[in-house]
Interface confidence: low
């Protein structure tokens, strides 16, 4: 994880943010922690976004203060109010939009001082792939499907037995636009598979990397999936 430390002012406190990514249409979290204060009533949390006039979110005197909130975030933000006193200023962002990407600032005021830190928030779509034996095909074929990706990812196949082999000649990948006209369904087909082998379908864009594994033997099929968010570069 990319962790940003920010210190400001003569009486400064340490504020720590973690670069993260949001999945379009789902809820996301912008992480921020700070040196806790013994008085909840003395803590002010402000979330700001570069290029946005109003506040993303403000929390003060133990409750949300949303009179200055920008319209684009209306009804979509919340802090974890029960965690503020132990130094958690993280922001929950509901229904993440593509336009939520950008640079955010977590600004904290406590009785000990002030501090802030920036975080880069990326938005896109990513989902877990599922690999199945395609029984409809005329030859031994595997089908890898993932319902939502954006931007368009790359798809690479690999196998445990033929490590390092290039499967581009024996695979076919298509991208189908979903109904909201942003995210796409990924379908990749691998031909001429052999029994007693483990195949991996790896889908990757600049936000996330996901892998779907399938082990095919004469007696059983075993599947496993894994998704990992990729670090954004430290600025």
């Amino acid at each position: 994880l990319i962790i940003g430390f920010g210190i400001s002012g003569r009486h400064s406190i340490t504020v720590t943010t973690v670069a993260s990514a949001g999945n379009i249409g789902e809820d996301g979290i912008l992480s921020c922690t700070f040196e806790p204060d013994i008085k909840l009533s003395d803590i002010v949390i402000q979330w700001l976004k570069e290029g946005v006039l109003g506040l993303v979110h403000e929390f003060k005197e133990g409750k949300d203060e949303l009179s200055e909130q920008d319209e684009m975030f209306r009804g979509r933000t919340a802090v974890f109010a029960d965690q503020v006193i132990v130094g958690n200023a993280s922001l929950r962002l509901k229904n993440v939009q593509l336009t939520d990407a950008g640079t955010y600032k977590c600004y904290i005021i406590t009785s000990k001082g002030k501090g802030n830190a920036n975080l880069e928030y990326k938005t896109g779509a990513f989902s877990m792939p599922e690999v199945n034996v395609d029984y409809n095909a005329s030859s031994e074929t595997l089908r890898c499907e993932a319902p939502r990706w954006f931007p368009q990812p790359t798809v690479v196949w690999a196998s445990q037995v033929d490590q390092g082999a290039n499967f581009s000649e024996v695979s076919n990948t298509s991208f189908e636009l979903n109904s909201e006209n942003v995210t796409m369904k990924v379908v990749s087909v691998l031909y001429n598979v052999t029994i007693n082998n483990t195949y991996s379908c790896m889908i990757e864009n600049d936000i996330a990397k996901a892998t779907g594994d399938i082990k095919v033997t004469e007696s059983e099929i075993k599947r496993r999936s894994h998704l990992q968010l990729l670090n954004s570069k430290a600025s």
């Epitope: 922690t33 040196e35 806790p36 013994i38 008085k39 909840l40 009533s41 005197e61 133990g62 409750k63 109010a81 029960d82 965690q83 503020v84 006193i85 132990v86 130094g87 958690n88």
Partner: antibody, heavy 116, light 107 residues
Framework: QVQLVQSGAEVKKPGSSMRVSCKAS????????ISWVRQAPGQGLEWMGG????????NYAQKFQGRVTITADKSTSTAYMELSSLRSEDTAVYYC?????????WGQGTLVTVSS | DIQLTQSPATLSVSPGERATLSCRAS??????LAWYQQKPGQAPRLLIY???IRATGIPARFSGSGSGTEFTLTISSLQSEDIATYYC?????????FGQGTRLEIK
């Protein structure tokens, strides 16, 4: 499942010290404060202090300042509360609880009896 | 320190009736108030926090209201399992303080 498991009951002499442990699940320990609350027989609840292991910070109620020490061992996800110079009025059930602002999970309680 | 005063000290209510418990703070605690239920020999159980938000698994018959210095816990239809002592607690400021408790009994 969040669980806070405390050490067993103790009988102590006046002037001595007591130490109660509270073992928490790992995620509780890394993300939440652990507080200590006591309850004398037939009496109400009294907050003694708390620690936020993730930040290494501790706060104590003024009443217990100088007599109470709250520590946390991250490697075992265990919090400890030590109270010194015991007197008979320290006889109470001592609870550890998850949270600093309010307490959503509690240990089972440890009865400490101070008697000569 | 912020003092919390609960009233009444003991409340007798018939099963199925409404029970109303009060908690008054010596200074404003905004919405930073929690309610707990404690039965004999058991640890307290969180009922309400943020003055009105029900904790996980708490039945809808329990509700909290108020803000600032005056708070109320209401049990809309008393069940026999609700017999317990109820405590309010503020967390706007340290030290965290509790009220002295209200004992709820069946009439």
């Amino acid at each position: 499942q969040v669980q806070l498991v405390q050490s067993g009951a103790e009988v102590k002499k006046p002037g001595s010290s007591m130490r109660v442990s509270c073992k928490a699940s790992e995620d509780t320990f890394s993300s939440y404060a652990i507080s200590w609350v006591r309850q004398a027989p037939g009496q109400g609840l009294e907050w003694m202090g708390g620690t936020a292991p993730i930040f290494g910070t501790t706060n104590y109620a003024q009443k217990f300042q100088g007599r109470v020490t709250i520590t946390a061992d991250k490697s075992t996800s265990t919090a400890y509360m030590e109270l010194s110079s015991l007197r008979s009025e320290d006889t109470a059930v001592y609870y550890c609880a998850r949270g600093g602002p309010y307490f959503d999970y509690w240990g089972q309680g440890t009865l400490v009896t101070v008697s000569s | 320190d912020i003092q919390l005063t609960q009233s009444p000290a003991t409340l007798s209510v018939s099963p199925g009736e409404r029970a109303t418990l009060s908690c008054r703070a010596s200074q404003s605690v905004s919405s930073n108030l929690a309610w707990y239920q404690q039965k004999p020999g058991q640890a307290p159980r969180l009922l309400i926090y943020g003055d009105y938000i029900r904790a996980t698994g708490i039945p809808a018959r329990f509700s909290g209201s108020g803000s600032g210095t005056e708070f109320t816990l209401t049990i809309s239809s008393l069940q026999s399992e609700d017999i317990a002592t109820y405590y309010c607690q503020q967390y706007v400021d340290l030290p965290i303080t509790f009220g002295q408790g209200t004992r709820l009994e069946i009439k």
